[in-house]
């Protein structure tokens, strides 16, 4: 029998290679049973996760899962870093794994590196 606890399914050690100036949607997959929990996004600053206030967020529904989406319109160089979503459920806080955004500032790059080039960077591979 499946648990009816809220689950946040951000993949562990996941990352996204994105470009400044582009739009980007960061998704937090949420599994719940009856009542949709309140979900928030935060950005890691060392060991502290700072809640993101006043940002454009939305919900998307799929068959067995909902997604709480953080919109970047557009991505800024300062958006580089790790993010986590958390849910309030029965007075408890459930935290997701963190996911990392690697932002390439197109102003400082002569051309966009390919995904393979991004993946070959040691700081990306072993972050």
């Amino acid at each position: 029998k499946e648990s009816c606890d809220v689950q946040l399914y951000i993949k562990r050690q996941s990352y996204h290679s994105i470009f400044a100036g582009d739009p980007f949607k960061l998704e937090c997959p949420v599994k719940y049973c009856a009542h949709r929990p309140q979900v928030t996004w935060c950005k890691l600053n060392g060991t502290t996760c700072v809640k993101l206030e006043g940002r454009h967020t939305s919900w998307k529904q799929e068959k067995n899962l909902s997604f709480f989406i953080l919109h970047f319109e557009p991505v800024l160089p300062s958006d580089n870093g790790s993010y986590r979503c958390s849910a309030n459920f029965l007075s408890a806080i459930i935290e997701s794994h963190s996911t990392t955004l690697y932002v390439t500032d197109v102003k400082s790059a002569s051309e966009r590196p390919s995904k393979d080039e991004m993946a070959s960077r040691p700081w990306l591979l072993y972050s």
């Epitope: 993949k11 996204h16 060991t47 899962l65 794994h97 995904k115 993946a119």
Partner: antibody, heavy 119, light 112 residues
């Protein structure tokens, strides 16, 4: 239930390439990682790498970087591993492995594909 | 890379008797999220591996409760309280805290 069905055995010559497939069913392919692990005859298990099917992002053991290429097709729920410049030491059973919602805990294993590299 | 060292490499056990396998990692496997990504896998002859234990001590569904896992940091143990004939095979520890993920070299369990 979760099922990972891998392609059939392959015999290749040294220097050739091989592309293995792993068709997933019974879970949401996009919301997990697909890993590849190999086992040479009579030897232990060796992690090759993993792919995030949702965006194609990969992580490889540096030993395989440049020679192994993992891809995934979310339309057919299939993960692929291509290994190039084959040598006799690549003779092994190759397993695809899925985990529960990207936990990276190697939950579900395919039946394995034997790749034999011989001249 | 993190080196996972298993001992013993083989053991022969009388049915009904206990068995214990040790796994030591070259670095602490405690992740920044507070979890320790240490699993144990069983590979029976001619079969694919299957996970027995994840996150050090959590038993997978369908795994008999005679199997247990313990440990922290760099030292981990798989115990079988009463070995049965169906337990024959090779047991591997595995770490998923650091890239690249690595397995121990395996411990072969035989029945006396």
């Amino acid at each position: 239930q979760v099922q990972l069905v891998q392609s059939g055995a392959e015999v290749k010559k040294p220097g050739a390439s091989v592309k293995l497939s792993c068709k997933a069913s019974g879970y949401n392919f996009k919301h997990t990682y697909a890993h590849w692990v190999r086992q040479a005859p009579g030897q232990g298990l060796e992690w090759i790498g993993r792919i995030d099917p949702a965006n194609g992002n990969t992580k490889y053991d540096p030993k395989f970087q440049g020679r192994a290429t993992m891809t995934a097709d979310t339309a057919s729920n299939t993960a692929y591993l291509e290994l190039s410049s084959l040598r006799s030491e690549d003779t092994a059973v190759y397993y695809c492995v899925a985990d529960h919602y990207g936990s990276s805990l190697l939950d579900y294993w395919g039946q394995g594909t034997l790749v034999t590299v011989s001249s | 890379d993190i080196v996972m060292t298993q001992t013993p490499l083989s053991l022969s056990v009388t049915p009904g008797q206990p068995a214990s396998i040790s796994c030591k990692s070259s670095q602490s496997l405690l992740d920044s999220d507070g979890k320790t990504y240490l699993n144990w896998f069983q590979q029976r002859p001619g079969q694919s591996p299957r996970r027995l234990i994840y996150l050090v001590s959590k038993l997978d569904s369908g795994v008999p409760d005679r199997f247990s896992g313990s440990g922290s940091g760099t030292d981990f143990t798989l115990k079988i309280s009463r070995v049965e004939a169906e337990d024959v095979g090779v047991y591997y520890c595995w770490q998923g805290t650091y890239f690249p993920y690595t397995f121990g070299q395996g411990t072969k369990l035989e029945i006396k």
